[in-house]
């Protein structure tokens, strides 16, 4: 009897949908695996007789519930199927946006770039998929614990009237208000402000 794959799960970030599993202990030799997806009531092969412990399902429709399954194989024997269901638009993790930061005197000028999507045109981003897409920005004075959050209305934001000659750190994430779903924070970007722009009279 061939044991089934273990710890079967979907790892999906920005619609890069990778079905992953672990190979069970099997004394007779090396196992191979077949992964399938349900399409119009028929299971279709996606990865056949692979020695890998993952299979890329990024070409699935972003909409709807998908049934995926994987089994282990050895010679003419095979395990039972292990099934999971997956809805990309609901289940995919929102990866960190890109961010460009520029210092202008005592201001930080930020521009945000929505995450790109696997198997899509360069310009079709997570912002196109989710109508309610917005950004959360978090910033703090470097070396302090107090963080401030803002929700920009656009793809850019300016933090004004900051302390001069002070390093501020900023990070951004995608947020979907209608789903109350937050994405992953970007890596902090830390920049030092320069002089106060106001000129004494």
């Amino acid at each position: 009897m061939v044991p089934p794959p273990e710890n079967v799960r979907m790892n999906s970030v920005n619609f890069k949908n990778i079905l992953q599993w672990e190979s069970p202990a099997f004394a007779k030799g090396n196992l191979t695996f077949t992964a399938q997806y349900l399409s119009y009531r028929i299971f279709q092969d996606k990865c056949m007789n692979t020695t890998l412990t993952e299979c890329d399902f990024s070409s699935l429709s972003k909409y709807g519930d998908h049934t995926l399954r994987v089994r282990a194989e050895f010679a003419d024997e095979h395990s039972d199927w292990v099934n999971i269901t997956f809805c990309p638009v609901d289940d995919t993790i929102i990866g960190p946006p890109g961010m460009q930061v520029e210092v202008l005197a005592d201001s930080l000028h930020m521009r945000f770039l929505a995450p790109k999507i696997e198997n899509e045109y360069e310009t079709w981003t997570m912002k196109n998929v989710y109508n309610s897409w917005t950004y959360n920005v978090q910033y703090w004075k470097n070396g302090t614990d107090e963080k401030f959050q803002i929700t920009p209305q656009y793809d850019f934001e300016v933090l004004r009237n900051l302390e001069p000659w002070t390093t501020y750190c900023v990070q951004v994430r995608g947020f979907l208000p209608d789903r109350n779903k937050a994405g992953e924070w970007s890596e902090p970007v830390c920049e030092q402000t320069t002089h106060d722009e106001t000129v004494p009279s």
Epitope: S59, L60, S61, K62, Y63, V89, N119, E120, Y121, T123, W124, N128, V129, N131
Partner: nanobody
Framework: EVQLVESGGGLVQPGGSLRLSCAAS????????IGWFRQAPGKGLEGVSC????????HYADSVKGRFTISRDNSKNTVYLQMNSLRAEDTAVYYC?????????????????WGQGTQVTVSS
């Protein structure tokens, strides 16, 4: 049942232009996303372009960027693909497709309705 109808294909010389049209027979073309795809002889289906109804944004494959333009005329319920500077490698059957959910642009899996296609041949 929605029926998409493409027209405007034909034989054109390299460097020439064509304008493809996509209309929905007896229906409005009121879908979140309309896309154009193509299939060259012996090749798989390839995304060419799409247009989003929500913001009017347009998106293109790298291979056609700067040469092809997608647009929609809501009064005529038609989506167009203007193809300029055509090359031999643009020879294919071109399909129009409509998405009910509008979540995707390039992947054929994200589209629900398809036309029968129109042949475009670029040859001297």
């Amino acid at each position: 049942e929605v029926q998409l109808v493409e027209s405007g294909g034909g034989l054109v010389q390299p460097g020439g232009s064509l304008r493809l049209s996509c209309a929905a027979s007896g229906n409005s073309l009121d879908y979140p996303t309309i896309g154009w795809f193509r299939q060259a002889p012996g090749k798989g289906l390839e995304g060419v372009s799409c247009i989003s109804a929500s913001d009017g944004s347009t998106h293109y494959a790298d291979s056609v960027k700067g040469r092809f333009t997608i647009s929609r005329d809501n009064s005529k319920n038609t989506v167009y693909l203007q193809m300029n500077s055509l090359r031999a490698e643009d020879t294919a059957v071109y399909y129009c497709a409509a998405s009910l959910h509008g979540l995707g642009c390039k992947s054929e899996a994200d589209y629900d309705y398809w036309g029968q296609g129109t042949q475009v041949t670029v040859s001297s």
